[in-house]
Interface confidence: low
């Protein structure tokens, strides 16, 4: 056993190169000073090590450095990242954005996995805040980034980060992710004129409230019936015909189309019939001509 | 987006060298290693080796030991594969390939070079 | 070196039929398998690594399992495309080898 373990005459790694590849594992455990794996770190990614060999390597960065690596050690990790759990991630400290991009790199086009969503996490809580050249980062390597964080992780997002925010990166994100963007996104474009700043607050508006929606209506904005299907219903109800007809401009006839899905049907049933009969599509389901219409709402507050 | 653009079609007498070479881009061409896989007409696929874009390192397969000779030029970010001493049986197609996640599985590939020897 | 032998050499299935095909390794290579489909003039395609873990963007019925040295790739409700010839390779050790390939015919 003792002599399985010592490293054969010869053998001693000088410097991490291609010979080590026909290394057994014990040969590698014995021959390789785990100093000089970690200061030649850079050249371990393009020699296609065996995923044996790699778990090697990472046991003698384990022993090196039980507290968890230093940065010059992380940064050139390469697919060694991929041997890494959770559990080891969670004793890094990673303040670099080079290192968070050189680590994503090696998982890009895949699914976000454990470990990138430690190191993340790990990075984020780091910086104190989701700054704009990691928002930037993150979701370049993952669209729908953004939309897997809690409300309250959003809320450490700065109104600033909004600018790197692509319409593709709230696809997935639920109404109440938007609530929390929705007020940030109004903040960072509030500067911009009437039709830049729907542009850019579009992709948002699945937050936002009545009264904003009234104003955006007074705007000539031609909202798509895509964004419109998106509003959250409590906001669109209190809607009237005509500002709906002005939110939604041309595209007013995309609500035939749509008449049984929410929010448009739960908007109708809202409406007076001879209200939404002046659109002309043929939408049913209105409040009956000659019915009164109570605000309850109202009433109860009233009360 | 990551791309290997493989030299054209090449065809050899018995007893010639061909140099395949394969340019590279979308990636940093020294960060990662490259393989060569052919394909003889018909067959399946043979692996002969790789190179370390990064130190010039090779491993080649026992097979084509003392034939095949795998060179980089890191300015052009582009790999060559010459293979010498041609027989017909080394009519081909000879691709490069780029791994994508560790561990040797071949995820970029080359569009392929068909290499025929015929006198 | 790890020999891969692939069974069966050919299939001919139908659409919306379930498709086997088993690569079996001459010694232990871990789970260090991949597939890969290649159409007739094309490069082969990634579909599966790690013996099961399937290759972002591959349709979902495909998928891969293991038990000791021998590997399956299975094709649920195959479809016209599905049409192409899979080849296993291992890369536990080198060479890094390739089963024989198994071509899979729609009928």
């Known amino acids: 056993e003792v002599e399985k373990t010592a490293c054969p005459s010869g053998k001693k790694a000088r410097e991490i190169d291609e010979s080590l590849i026909f290394y057994k594992k014990w040969e590698l455990e014995a021959c390789v000073d785990a100093a000089l794996l970690a200061t030649q770190m850079d050249r371990v990614n393009a020699i296609p090590f065996t995923y044996e060999q790699l778990d090697v390597l990472k046991h003698k960065l384990d022993e090196l450095y039980p507290q968890g690596y230093p940065e010059s050690v992380i940064q050139h990790l390469g697919y060694l990242f991929l041997k890494m759990s959770p559990e080891d991630i969670r004793k890094w400290n990673v303040t670099s954005l080079e290192t968070l991009k050189a680590l994503l790199e090696v998982n890009k086009g895949h699914e976000m996995s454990p470990q990138v969503a430690t190191l993340i996490d790990r990075f984020v809580k780091g910086r104190g805040q989701l700054d704009k050249d990691t928002l930037d980062t993150l979701t370049a390597f993952y669209p729908g980034y953004l939309c897997s964080l809690s409300p309250e992780e959003l809320s450490s997002v700065p109104p600033s980060s909004i600018w790197a925010v692509r319409p593709q990166d709230l696809d997935t994100c639920d109404p109440r992710q938007l609530d929390v963007l929705y007020p940030k996104a109004r903040l960072a474009f509030q500067n911009m004129n009437g039709s830049e700043y729907f542009v850019k607050i579009q992709s948002f508006l699945g937050g936002a409230p009545t009264e904003d929606l009234k104003a955006l209506s007074q705007q000539n904005v031609s909202m798509d019936l895509a964004t419109f299907m998106k509003l959250r219903t409590d906001a669109v109800l209190p809607l009237t015909v005509a500002e709906v007809q002005k939110l939604l401009g041309p595209h007013v006839e995309g609500l035939k189309a749509e008449e049984r899905h929410r929010p448009v049907r739960d908007w109708i049933l809202r409406q007076r019939q001879d209200d939404l009969d002046t659109l002309g599509l043929g939408l049913q389901g209105g409040i009956p001509n000659g019915y009164l219409v109570l605000d309850l709402s109202m009433q109860e507050a009233l009360s | 987006q990551v791309q290997l653009q493989q030299s054209g079609a090449e065809v050899k007498k018995p007893g010639a060298s061909v140099k395949v070479s394969c340019k590279t881009s979308?990636?940093?061409?020294?960060?990662?290693?490259l393989h060569w896989v052919r394909q003889a007409p018909g067959q399946g696929l043979e692996w002969m080796g790789w190179?370390?874009?990064?130190?010039?390192?090779?491993n080649y397969a026992q097979k084509f030991q003392g034939r095949v000779t795998m060179t980089r030029d890191t300015s052009i970010s582009t790999a060559y594969m010459e293979l010498s001493r041609l027989r017909s049986d080394d009519t081909a197609v000879y691709y490069c390939?780029?791994?994508?996640?560790?561990?040797?599985?071949?995820?970029?590939w080359g569009q392929g070079t068909l290499v025929t020897v015929s006198s | 070196d790890i020999q891969l032998t692939q069974s069966p050499s050919s299939i001919s299935a139908s659409v919306g039929d379930t498709v086997s095909i088993t690569c079996r390794a001459s010694q232990d290579s871990g789970t260090w398998l991949a597939w890969y489909q290649q159409k007739p003039g094309k490069a082969p395609n990634l579909l599966m690594y790690d013996a099961s873990t399937l290759e972002d963007g591959v349709p979902s019925r495909f998928s891969g399992s293991a038990s000791g040295t021998e590997f399956t790739l299975t094709v649920n409700r195959l479809q016209p495309e599905d049409s192409a010839t899979y080849y296993c390779?291992?890369?536990?050790?080198?060479?890094?080898?390739f089963g024989g390939g198994t071509k899979v015919d729609i009928k």
């Open positions: 190179i370390n874009p990064n130190s010039g390192g090779t």
């Open positions: 979308g990636y940093p061409f020294t960060g990662y290693s």
């Open positions: 390779q291992q890369y536990n050790s080198y060479p890094l080898t």
């Open positions: 390939a780029r791994d994508h996640y560790g561990g040797n599985s071949l995820f970029y």
